[in-house]
Amino acid sequence: MAVTACQGLGFVVSLIGIAGIIAATCMDQWSTQDLYNNPVTAVFNYQGLWRSCVRESSGFTECRGYFTLLGLPAMLQAVRALMIVGIVLGAIGLLVSIFALKCIRIGSMEDSAKANMTLTSGIMFIVSGLCAIAGVSVFANMLVTNFWMSTANMYTGMGGMVQTVQTRYTFGAALFVGWVAGGLTLIGGVMMCIACRGLAPEETNYKAVSYHASGHSVAYKPGGFKASTGFGSNTKNKKIYDGGARTEDEVQSYPSKHDYV
């Protein structure tokens, strides 16, 4: 039961995290105009990964896409790449994890296969979360660098007469959404990996062997189940150890208590 809960919770947490990563990537407020210690302006500037926007106090908002690829800073391109890789990995991870969920039964899929899929999706979620956190952190570092550079020459004087307002940018809402979302995806991935350990069948399955008087043809099945002779019923035969492995027939006929929530 704990394994199913851990797996289910990991899936839900990762789902929320990936939704957050997608939201952060699409958001326009990656960097916002710094209002502190700045001349009070009748416009509010903010920028995303894909476009920059200006909200005028009069109520009009105007956004312009970055229609160039080559003209954009390499760091911005890197952030875009990290976020997209994070989304793609996360989406694939979600797809894999749906089939890996213990509460969902698909044909005659063995627990070992589900365990492997859970581990795969968990790793994908971890990498996805790390990509998002890295992307957001790179952008934040870029902002901090630019902030202090623009602070150093906030007013560029022209002959000491004319002042030009230098717009400084600070952290936007998308950065915090990205950090939290990346963290959630990472946590979800770790939970999936933990759940995988509980799903995996034990390796040490002892083989049950029946000993009989010579002359009989002895047959046994590995895995600790019904070893039988060529003659009728065998009363001596005992099930030594059940490591959780079952035949296909038994999986279909006798679902375990963990198969339904």
Epitope: Q33, T41, A42, S57, S58
Partner: antibody, heavy 117, light 113 residues
């Protein structure tokens, strides 16, 4: 058609308060702002302040201590209140609607205010 | 506060003449976020409220004749009337629409020669 109309007292005694109402039509005060501008007789335009759609206000630094702008969105009215009037506050007071690039695209006809004892 | 300096303070012209008036601001009115200049030009005739002619330094308001042209960027702006008509005789004001307080220039009075 967007319209703005100012209504004021006309004559106010020095040291008293001036209250002017601007009634707007054909646009929402929850979306758009209203600016106040005055013009002393024979002089230029002076921007006083603005109340934006979200309710935030900005005032001219020289008048910040005695000027307040408020609004009643349900009645489509904006109010200007200027305290401690002096004779140099005598002017025609206009309300105007800021549009694209914050430029004032619609103006009221103005209301003339004389500060005199 | 931003100081808006208009020159000349008055202009005497004949009908059909080309007129240019200047407006300088003490700070740049160019917003880096959208590379737009936040400067407006108004025309005021006696006994009337001001009328918006140009916004964003160069965009003509709807209904304004195309003989009115706004130009300039940053701190230096110009209003040009390509061929002055009798109805253009008025006072022209420029206004900073970027940094509070949204100050006006002192105006340029256009008179008939």
């Amino acid at each position: 058609q967007v319209q703005l109309k100012e209504s004021g007292p006309g004559l106010v005694a020095p040291s008293q308060s001036l209250s002017i109402t601007c009634t707007v039509s054909e646009f929402s005060l929850t979306t758009y702002g209203v600016s106040w501008v005055r013009q002393p007789p024979g002089k230029g335009l002076e921007w006083l302040g603005v109340i934006w759609g979200d309710g935030s206000t900005n005032y001219h630094s020289a008048l910040i201590s005695r000027l307040s702008i408020s609004k009643d969105t349900s009645k489509s009215q904006v109010f200007l209140k200027l305290n401690s009037l002096q004779t140099d506050d005598t002017a025609t007071y206009y309300c105007a609607k800021p549009g694209l690039r914050n430029a004032m695209d619609y103006w009221g006809q103005g209301t003339s205010v004389t500060v005199s004892s | 506060d931003i100081v808006m300096t208009q020159s000349p303070s008055s202009l005497s012209v004949s009908a059909g003449e080309k007129v240019t008036m200047s407006c300088k601001s003490s700070q740049s009115l160019l917003n880096s976020g959208n590379q737009k200049n936040y400067l407006a030009w108004y025309q005021q005739k006696p006994g009337q409220p001001p009328k918006l002619l140009i916004y964003g330094a160069s965009t003509r308001e709807s209904g304004v004749p195309d003989r009115f042209t706004g130009s300039g960027s940053g701190t230096d702006f110009t209003l040009t009337i390509s061929s002055v008509q009798a109805e253009d005789l008025a006072v022209y004001y420029c206004q900073n629409d970027l940094i509070y307080p949204l100050t006006f220039g002192a105006g340029t009075k256009l008179e008939l020669k």
